[in-house]
């Protein structure tokens, strides 16, 4: 993928609302291009914060002003609506509502949209074909919630337009505006270290790979040309500078470490894999 992001690409907004009691509540809103956070919401000033220089996409200042106002109104109303219906819906304080909504892109074309709401971390209701539907496992509370939400088709139409018109237009502009950033190639650095001892006579070898972009990477412990199937790959973790970090570990008997190496493949290396030999690494660390 030329944009350095794995298909399918998505843009989504998440709203995490914590209701501690009848009058004390808090919310966190953020916007994401796949796994890259591009926007956040400043609750104090009720404004959208653009986290990347290209986070505005190709939307005008006027469009941003309108969206900001829409989010402000909807946040206030959503909070109030949930607070008002909490007792009726048997929501027990403290509780958390998580909402995620956005759209997906496949091969440069919009492939769909989504909007889901969870209560206490479990699927509750979702928005499909212009109306709210309960998740079957969520029971009667979710059915009642949908009944309330679906009383207002015009409100649902506004939601539908956000998902099926505004979001697709935005994600295309965002990808275009962020092209240089998203298509950049940053070479990884790699180093080896000992992990905590797995037991007597055994070693844990750790291969650290950091500072790479885009995210897809291949890391493997090798013996000669033989991939070591015992390689344990950790999660690829984000770094503050927008690059990624990964560690791959291998447990071996102390005497079998000598001819092991860690091999790293990444698009930025243009076929010139990084290979680090355990026997060459200093015993520090």
């Amino acid at each position: 993928n030329a944009d350095g992001l794995k298909e399918p690409l998505s843009f989504h907004v998440t709203w995490i609302a914590s209701f501690y009691n009848h009058s004390w509540k808090q919310n966190l809103v953020s916007g994401w291009l796949s796994d890259l956070q591009t926007h956040t919401w400043d609750s104090n000033s009720s404004t959208i914060v653009f986290l990347c220089p290209w986070s505005r996409g190709n939307f005008s200042n006027e469009e941003w002003k309108e969206l900001e106002t829409l989010f402000r109104i909807r946040t206030i109303r959503s909070f109030e609506g949930i607070r008002r219906y909490a007792h009726e819906l048997q929501f027990e304080y403290p509780f958390e509502i998580q909402v995620t909504g956005g759209c997906e892109l496949h091969s440069g074309k919009v492939s769909g949209s989504f909007l889901q709401l969870a209560y206490q971390g479990s699927d509750f209701v979702s928005f499909q074909n212009n109306s709210w539907l309960p998740y079957p496992v969520a029971g009667n509370m979710a059915k009642h919630f949908c009944k309330v939400l679906n009383q207002n088709q015009h409100e649902n139409d506004i939601t539908h337009n956000l998902l099926s018109d505004t979001c697709p237009r935005f994600i295309l502009g965002l990808l275009d505006a962020g092209k240089a950033h998203l298509q950049r190639q940053v070479k990884p650095e790699a180093w080896l270290s000992h992990g905590p001892s797995p037991g007597p006579g055994h070693l844990q070898l750790v291969c650290h790979v950091s500072g790479f972009y885009p995210k897809p990477v291949w890391v493997m412990w090798m013996r000669g040309e033989q991939e070591q199937q015992g390689t344990q790959r950790g999660d690829i973790l984000p770094s503050a500078d927008g690059t990624w970090y990964l560690r791959a570990t291998l447990e071996v008997a102390a005497g079998e470490a000598a001819d092991l190496s860690c091999r790293v493949k990444h698009s930025s290396l243009e076929g010139q894999d990084i290979v680090l030999y355990w026997e060459h690494h200093s015993s520090v660390g």
């Epitope: 106002t69 109104i73 109303r77 212009n130 015009h154 139409d157 539908h160 337009n161 018109d165």
Partner: antibody, heavy 112, light 110 residues
Framework: SVEESGGRLVTPGTPLTLTCTAS????????MSWVRQAPGKGLEWIGI?????STYYASWAKGRFTISKTSTTVDLKITSPTTEDTATYFC??????????WGQGTLVTVSS | AVEMTQTPASVSAAVGGTVTINCQAS??????LAWYQQKPGQPPKLLIY???TLASGVPSRFKGSGSGTEYTLTISGVQCDDAATYYC????????????FGGGTEVVVK
């Protein structure tokens, strides 16, 4: 832009349809409202047709008006006009919740 | 249904002065309020939406504020061109599918 047409002098009880023509934007992504203004009086909201075609009316307007649309026009039918319906009728585009684009209005006079 | 009460019905101000128009909703409308300006023979023009956001091209001497049920439009440094009638509107009453307007305030500039 939006432009209203169809306003004229009618006798009480004669149904009248006003048309609002939208250009430069799609009625499938915008709701449209009808608002009227009697001579020397304030603005009075009549009703709205949402992007999906759902219609909502002010309580006083239910049964007296019908809103419908095609891909490029929005109609307001005054089912049985009375002299109190004499007014300039405006069509306006709704962006999210506010009316940001208005037509010049069309004058309806109901008189015997 | 939400009802909008706008005061005063008429106000006069000298050029450079300040005008304040109030709008009260019969229930909390969550800042979903718009202000419009209308001059004789013209359609209304959107001034402010979301209670405080200035519409495109509107001079910064217009300021909207308020929350809950109480909202205010303030015109600072009034100019001759501001002579018009101003309307507030609950920009969407989801309980009764209405968008009711206030009665209007005529601003006369001396």
């Amino acid at each position: 832009s939006v432009e209203e047409s169809g306003g004229r002098l009618v006798t009480p009880g004669t149904p009248l349809t006003l048309t609002c023509t939208a250009s430069g934007f799609s009625l499938s992504t915008y709701a449209m409202s009808w608002v009227r203004q009697a001579p020397g009086k304030g603005l009075e909201w009549i009703g709205i047709i949402s992007s999906s075609g759902s219609t909502y009316y002010a309580s006083w307007a239910k049964g007296r008006f019908t809103i419908s649309k095609t891909s490029t026009t929005v109609d307001l039918k005054i089912t049985s006009p009375t002299t109190e319906d004499t007014a300039t009728y405006f069509c306006a585009r709704e962006t999210w919740y506010w009316l940001d684009l208005w037509g010049q209005g069309t004058l309806v006079t109901v008189s015997s | 249904a939400v009802e909008m009460t706008q005061t005063p019905a008429s106000v006069s101000a000298a050029v450079g002065g300040t005008v304040t128009i109030n709008c009260q909703a019969s229930e909390d409308i969550y800042s979903n309020l718009a202000w419009y300006q209308q001059k004789p023979g013209q359609p209304p023009k959107l001034l402010i939406y979301g209670a405080s956001t200035l519409a495109s091209g509107v001079p910064s001497r217009f300021k909207g504020s308020g929350s809950g049920t109480e909202y205010t439009l303030t015109i600072s440094g009034v100019q001759c061109d501001d002579a018009a009638t101003y309307y507030c509107q609950c920009a969407y009453d989801s309980s009764s599918y209405g968008t009711p307007f206030g009665g209007g305030t005529e601003v006369v500039v001396k």
